[in-house]
């Protein structure tokens, strides 16, 4: 498929654009804003004459140079100045500030906990399948298959540490070679970047906020994908990671050490352990080919057990497998030996919610997945609103300057490297790159952190998670020390190589440009963000895995033409941008292709049609949910009762504004329930602009 023109700045005059999103319409006076035609992002639309030659090419609002959506927004302070407040007002303001800070910490805590529960939910839903991916050893010797298995497993269990520990166990028990494990580690690195991309989806309410948040999250994805694109073939050809890590291990003598401190787990575990506790050894056992593990539940039932070691007669294949010649005998058919068998005696049950439910893993997983996503979404909305209310005026200026300003010349280049160190340090503290990058996503969305600054922080996070893995490897038992350390080092040097590829030279910071391009597309067509997520993290890896099952010839037969087509499109795209004159007239743009092949507009129409159809059919069922949501968000949504009517009729009806009764406005409902027609809700002194519906 040809590249989307949305990524091009093909317009000769950036001030002329279709249905202006910003710029010309900014002159509309306030009083007219209520009546002016608006697009679905709530911005007024100015109809502009369009040159026919650009009609099929420029399908996205190209903002004028003066108003770049990637510029960090000015967080205006509309409140009363400190000096203008009386004593009572000042005390109230202090208490408000403390209250907001406590609320922020509370929501942040819930946010991190919900990420933990989300990971558990994913493991319950797809953990066993993930384990089975690993148990297919023959496929994993193929590096491409290994890569996609790494992606799929990490996406399924939402934890790169789980997939890494499985790989370590498999290498330690010689089920997998280090060479075969390296592509899987690369895949796990990609898979772990899905979490913050999911978190970014929660910010789809406001187009510009979503643009920034999604780009900020996907910069991680692009870094990982691009690194793999270069480093996987390099590793397959030279085995440099394997050789380098071998050299490191031979040069330095590593002793068992302390594991990294679990600072965040100490805080979150008391809460998350009340919700669910998993026996992660089950996934590992499935991966190791234990057929019995397939029937075990991942849900931990017994938390306190006593292990009794008893001597048991067991059969062995031959006398060589006996514990010792003294403990070896035969019954004439089989050879027997004495083995110490550990029998578990259950003492006390775990204290989580699902301990006494005899629900299957899948059911518990789906329940937890739904609940954790709702909490994640809710927390994110609240964090964004709280931050939006706190980060105004001076505070915002200070924070933005601190985070986004470079060192003075000639040390400006050092700023990014300091950000990498900060990202690594913060990740090391919280022991999870997912938590760090997910927490950073809303900050990028609201404009506190720029994409340019988020990029090195994300790269640092990638390094931080590998240093954690190295420490964990050093704390592992003697029999797995070498393999776990080598894998952790492979992971570390892979990320270092990636940084060397895509960071030091500004020109090579391709992930930023690609993420911004994707951010632009997703801001206009928000469904594309979901499509991107499903396509790159599920469909593509599954397809490649399926083709790998069929064997190398099939994989090459299907893969090579696709790769050649992509390369052809990229070459053509570069020629169109750099030197279109050498191309025939027909190939200077993508108009020679059907519209659906070079624009998302037709696809958008189909999806809009499908969703409106879905709304019409399913709305009645959703009426109860709608009312509950309205009760939670505090506005009695008049549309809930009318949702079974035809949408055509509904569009004719006027929105009846209902005053919000003290809750935050709900992102998904805000268009329907605007506070006094202005779309603003003031709670704890916060003015939070209402957002449009998510999709």
């Amino acid at each position: 498929m040809a590249p989307w023109p949305e990524l091009e700045n093909a317009h000769p005059n950036p001030n002329k654009f279709i249905e202006g999103a910003s710029g010309p319409q900014s002159s509309i006076p306030d009083k007219d804003k209520g009546t002016s035609k608006t697009n679905d992002s709530g911005t007024p639309v100015a109809k502009i004459e369009l040159l026919p030659s650009y009609s099929a090419l420029v399908l996205i609002e190209e903002p004028p140079e003066g108003n770049d959506p990637w510029d960090l927004p000015e967080l205006q302070d509309n409140g009363i100045k400190w000096s203008e407040r009386d004593s009572k007002g000042k005390i109230l303001c202090i208490f408000q500030g403390i209250g907001k800070f406590i609320l922020l910490l509370g929501f942040l805590y819930l946010f991190v906990c919900s990420l933990d529960v989300l990971s558990s939910a994913f493991q319950l839903v797809g953990g066993k399948m993930a384990g089975q991916f690993f148990s297919n050893n023959s496929i994993m010797s193929n590096p491409v298959a290994g890569l996609v298995i790494g992606v799929l497993v990490t996406v399924m269990v939402q934890s790169s540490s789980t997939s890494s520990s499985i790989i370590v166990s498999m290498v330690a028990s010689s089920l997998l070679s280090v060479r075969a494990a390296i592509p899987i580690i690369m895949g796990a690195n990609i898979g772990t970047s899905i979490t913050n991309t999911i978190v970014a989806l929660m910010q789809a309410g406001d187009r510009n906020e979503f643009r920034r948040a999604f780009a900020g999250a996907t910069v991680h994805d692009f870094f990982n994908w691009l690194s793999v694109l270069v480093l996987l073939p390099l590793e397959a050809a030279t085995h440099y990671l394997e050789k380098l890590t071998n050299l490191v291990l031979e040069t330095f003598s590593f002793q068992n050490g302390e594991d990294a401190p679990d600072i965040l787990k100490v805080i979150t575990d008391p809460f998350t352990k009340l919700i669910i506790q998993l026996d992660k050894k089950v996934i590992q056992q499935i991966a190791m080919g234990d057929s019995e593990a397939q029937n075990k539940s991942l849900i931990k039932i017994w938390c306190k057990t006593i292990s009794n070691v008893i001597e048991e007669n067991v059969t062995v294949p031959s006398p060589d497998n006996c514990t010792s010649p003294s403990y070896c005998w035969t019954d004439g058919i089989q050879t027997w030996t004495i083995q110490n068998v550990t029998e578990k005696e259950n003492i006390a049950k775990c204290q989580h919610i699902f301990v006494n439910f005899s629900l299957p893993d899948l059911a518990v997983g789906i329940i937890l997945l739904t609940v954790s996503l709702l909490i994640l979404c809710g927390c994110l909305i609240m964090i964004v609103k709280l931050l939006g209310s706190v980060l105004r005026g001076q505070v915002a200026t200070v924070i933005k300057k601190t985070l986004n300003t470079d060192f003075p010349f000639p040390f400006a280049w050092l700023t990014g490297y300091l950000a990498i160190l900060v990202g690594a340090g913060m990740t090391f503290i919280v022991q999870s790159s997912s938590v760090f990058t997910s927490a950073m996503t809303p900050l990028i969305g609201i404009g506190v952190i720029s994409i340019e600054r988020a990029y090195p922080l994300t790269l640092g996070s990638n390094i931080g998670t590998t240093t954690t893995a190295i420490l964990a490897a050093l704390a592992s038992p003697g029999n797995t020390l070498r393999s776990s350390l080598q894998i952790a080092l492979c992971h570390f040097f892979f990320n270092i190589s990636g940084i060397l590829l895509w960071y030091p030279i500004p020109f090579t910071r391709l992930p930023i440009r690609l993420a911004k391009g994707l951010g632009n597309i997703s801001a206009k067509y928000r469904w594309f963000a979901v499509f991107y997520l499903i396509f790159f993290f599920l469909l593509t890896p599954l397809t490649v895995f399926g083709l790998s099952l069929a064997g190398w010839p099939v994989l090459v037969g299907v893969g090579v033409p696709i790769i050649l087509l992509i390369l052809l499109v990229l070459c053509l795209r570069m020629l169109q941008a750099r030197c279109p004159r050498i191309l025939p007239l027909k190939l200077r743009d993508w108009n020679f292709l059907p519209l659906w092949m070079h624009s998302l507009k037709p696809w958008d129409n189909i999806i809009s049609l499908a969703t409106s159809c879905f709304q019409r059919r399913c709305c009645c069922c959703c009426r109860v949910c709608c009312r509950v949501c309205c009760m939670v968000c505090g506005c009695k949504c008049c549309r809930c009762s009318k949702c079974c009517k035809n949408l055509e009729e509904e569009e004719k009806e006027q929105d009846v504004p209902v005053k919000a009764s003290g809750g935050f406005d709900n992102t998904a409902m805000s268009k329907e329930c605007q506070d006094e027609g202005k779309g603003q809700v003031e709670v704890l002194g916060m003015k939070a602009l209402s957002n449009t519906t998510v999709f």
Partner: antibody, heavy 120, light 107 residues
Framework: QVQLVQSGAEVVKPGASVKMSCKTS????????MHWVRQAPGQGLEWIGA????????SYNQKFKGRVTLTADKSTSTAYMELSSLRSEDTAVYYC?????????????WGQGTLVTVSS | DIQMTQSPSSLSASVGDRVTITCKAS??????VAWYQQKPGKVPKLLIY???TRHTGVPSRFSGSGSGTDFTLTISSLQPEDVATYYC?????????FGGGTKVEIK
């Protein structure tokens, strides 16, 4: 009580084969390994092999491998031993025996024996 | 194969005497040794297994000891009915092997 009743004495020519039976009663046939031991006149005991009637798994003394076949018929609770390519030194009393001491090769019940005489 | 060497090949003792028969294995067999008694014209009878465990119905005057490669069968007080040939057997490895036998007679 456990009983192992073996077939009668056989006189066979060198190079021929002999198939003897061991009919069991008083226990569950498929539970215990059935061993075959021989004793040449005035000599010691020599283990030939064993069969687990439950699965049909067999184990043979390398000395007899290729010449001996152990089988078991679960329907009649009878074990069989066939010895081929007989030589004069195969003249012996052949015993079937079982070990009810689970997991050991110590045999505690014996058949009365089948005398096989190899003579031209 | 593991060789089991029994000694003596025959012995003569008086009623009431303490009789000791030894058996030496060519390699470590742990404690996987059994002792059998075979009276003239009869089938062998299991006396002891696991080196020292007496089989059901075996008189207490019979005892076994040893481990590894050296094993002993002891008849604490020889009785006229104990006249027989005694065999040791290892069941540590396949094939199971027997000793050459010790013939016990009464003086």
């Amino acid at each position: 009580q456990v009983q192992l009743v073996q077939s009668g004495a056989e006189v066979v020519k060198p190079g021929a084969s002999v198939k003897m039976s061991c009919k069991t009663s008083g226990y569950t046939f498929i539970t215990y390994n059935m061993h075959w031991v021989r004793q040449a006149p005035g000599q010691g005991l020599e283990w030939i092999g064993a069969i687990y009637p439950g699965s049909g798994d067999t184990s043979y003394n390398q000395k007899f491998k290729g010449r001996v076949t152990l089988t078991a018929d679960k329907s009649t609770s009878t074990a069989y031993m066939e010895l081929s390519s007989l030589r004069s030194e195969d003249t012996a009393v052949y015993y079937c025996s079982i070990s009810t001491i689970i997991t050991t090769g110590a045999v505690d019940y014996w058949g009365q024996g089948t005398l096989v005489t190899v003579s031209s | 194969d593991i060789q089991m060497t029994q000694s003596p090949s025959s012995l003569s003792a008086s009623v009431g005497d303490r009789v000791t028969i030894t058996c030496k294995a060519s390699q470590d067999v742990g404690t996987a040794v059994a002792w059998y008694q075979q009276k003239p014209g009869k089938v062998p009878k299991l006396l002891i297994y696991w080196t020292s465990t007496r089989h059901t119905g075996v008189p207490s005057r019979f005892s076994g000891s040893g481990s590894g490669t050296d094993f002993t069968l002891t008849i604490s007080s020889l009785q006229p009915e104990d006249v027989a040939t005694y065999y040791c057997q290892q069941y540590s490895r396949i094939p199971l092997t027997f000793g050459g036998g010790t013939k016990v007679e009464i003086k």
